[in-house]
């Protein structure tokens, strides 16, 4: 899909403003918050999506054990700084000059410091573990059906190359989806696993980023998969640097 010519909207990002002011009167879409032009044939980067979200009016078999270095996004929403390509800048600061380093999915990976804090590089998140608990059903889902449908979802809805969906684990009622993508594996044009995971997370919460009817209806052999809880663990190519105080808290 590209931006639809007839009504000029962005199929892959509803947090955009679109107008036919591109070359030859073509539809061009810009992300809210940053004003950056986005490619509506693929997913928008998480950084631009978070920025758009902050600018929008506020509404009143064996399961994997995450490694000791796995990060969970406990800090929640913030207004990020994005680079010209829409990626997170390695160092993020708030309005009170408190700064911290983030990974490629925008999750804090150091203690908070002041403006003197240095973040030498944007560290890549190469392994994402999505941990879901589904609502009780009459019986367990068939593992192979569940695996096939989740792989199809990531391939067709999020346009993530199948090789990056490393595994789907299932022990009722827990589902785990493992996404893996090293720097060396990611070719130009490949969807980033962090972006795919973010779109999936928003879909599961009923906050779809796609234009359309506003909900993900995920079915396994006709039965809706209703997710009660979502936890996402992020593993970076270089382990995070937190003080011992935080690690023992």
């Amino acid at each position: 899909h590209t931006a639809a010519q007839d009504n000029c909207t962005c199929p892959t990002n509803k947090m955009t403003v679109c107008s036919p002011d591109g070359p030859g009167g073509r539809c061009q879409c810009r992300a809210l918050g940053s004003g950056m032009a986005v490619d509506c044939s693929t997913l928008t980067s998480k950084c631009l999506l978070l920025k758009a979200r902050m600018s929008a009016p506020k509404n009143a078999r064996t399961l994997v054990r995450p490694s000791e270095h796995a990060l969970v996004d406990n800090d929640g929403l913030y207004d990020p700084d994005c680079d010209p390509e829409g990626r997170f800048k390695a160092r993020q600061c708030n309005q009170t000059s408190v700064c911290w380093c983030v990974n490629s999915v925008g999750v804090r990976r150091t203690d908070k410091g002041d403006l003197s804090l240095r973040c030498d590089e944007l560290v890549r998140t190469h392994h994402i573990l999505i941990d879901l608990r589904h609502r009780p059903t009459a019986g367990a889902f068939n593992h192979s059906d569940l695996d096939a449908e989740l792989r199809r979802l990531f391939r067709e809805r999020y346009r993530l190359h199948p090789k990056f969906v490393a595994a789907v684990h299932y022990e009722q009622p827990t589902i785990q989806i493992e996404l893996r993508q090293n720097t060396s594996q990611k070719a130009a044009g490949d969807v980033d696993i962090g972006d795919a995971a973010y779109y999936f997370e928003r879909d599961i919460k009923g906050e779809s980023l796609f234009q359309g009817r506003g909900g993900l209806d995920l079915r396994v052999r006709g039965e809706p998969l209703q997710v009660e809880r979502t936890l996402i663990y992020y593993l970076d190519e270089i382990p995070p640097k937190f003080s011992m105080k935080r690690l023992t808290a």
Epitope: G206, R213, G214, G215, E228
Partner: antibody, heavy 119, light 112 residues
Framework: QVQLQESGPGLVKPSETLSLTCTVS????????VNWIRQPPGKGLEWIGV???????NYNSALMSRLTISKDTSKNQFSLKLSSVTAADTAVYYC?????????????WGQGTLVTVSS | DIVMTQSPDSLAVSLGERATINCKSS????????????LAWYQQKPGQPPKLLIS???SRESGVPDRFSGSGSGTDFTLTISSLQAEDVAVYYC????????FGGGTKVEIK
């Protein structure tokens, strides 16, 4: 542009098998499923069954023993077979696209084909 | 199987007046995770296939006039036509997709 078109014999004899085809265009059969719905003359809508994008099927429990839904991706066609028909199976038969992950709504329908069961 | 019960069976309303159609399901259609209801409303005019009006109980489809609105949650749902127009004469159906699919019996809307 999304289109669905039902086709098949307009008249079927009692106890025989009703066979219908739904030919689609404008979308991939691996990305969307197709439902069959019927409507007896002057009556309401009854869901018959679905073939999901992944290839699995679900049928209306009242019709399950007589029903088969399949697809031929190379021909862009879905087919419905209903065996041992009676006059109660006389209806307009519709096929409709499932909206995949955007909700199981039927946003695109064929125009329908009337099937009469009579000797 | 989930049973969908619509009321009334038929409804005669003056042009410009409000028309209200009710739909009750035999079990809740609410997805507690996404807080969305698996309910749709369709309009069918004579000799035509049904047309999707409302999805997720209250989301109006693009191109559907804003005089049509859907409300409700769980087991009780309502379709409201705020100001009936001549072109709204049709049969209206609710449909659940929480557990496969079931249509309500339909409500015929006419002009008084």
């Amino acid at each position: 542009q999304v289109q669905l078109q039902e086709s098949g014999p307009g008249l079927v004899k009692p106890s025989e098998t009703l066979s219908l085809t739904c030919t689609v265009s404008g979308f991939s059969l691996t990305s969307y499923g197709v439902n069959w719905i019927r409507q007896p003359p002057g009556k309401g809508l009854e869901w018959i069954g679905v073939m999901w994008a992944g290839g699995s099927t679900n049928y209306n429990s009242a019709l399950m023993s007589r029903l088969t839904i399949s697809k031929d991706t190379s021909k862009n066609q879905f087919s419905l077979k209903l065996s041992s028909v009676t006059a109660a199976d006389t209806a307009v038969y519709y096929c409709a696209r499932d909206e995949n992950w955007d909700g199981a709504w039927f946003a695109y329908w064929g125009q329908g084909t009337l099937v009469t069961v009579s000797s | 199987d989930i049973v969908m019960t619509q009321s009334p069976d038929s409804l005669a309303v003056s042009l410009g007046e409000r028309a209200t159609i009710n739909c009750k399901s035999s079990q809740s259609l609410l997805n507690s995770g996404t807080r969305k209801n698996y309910l749709a409303w369709y309009q069918q005019k004579p000799g035509q296939p049904p047309k999707l009006l409302i999805s997720w109980a209250s989301s109006r489809e693009s191109g559907v006039p804003d005089r049509f609105s859907g409300s409700g949650s769980g087991t009780d749902f309502t379709l409201t036509i705020s100001s009936l127009q001549a072109e709204d004469v049709a049969v209206y159906y609710c449909k659940q997709s929480y557990n496969l699919f079931t249509f309500g019996g339909g409500t015929k809307v006419e002009i008084k």
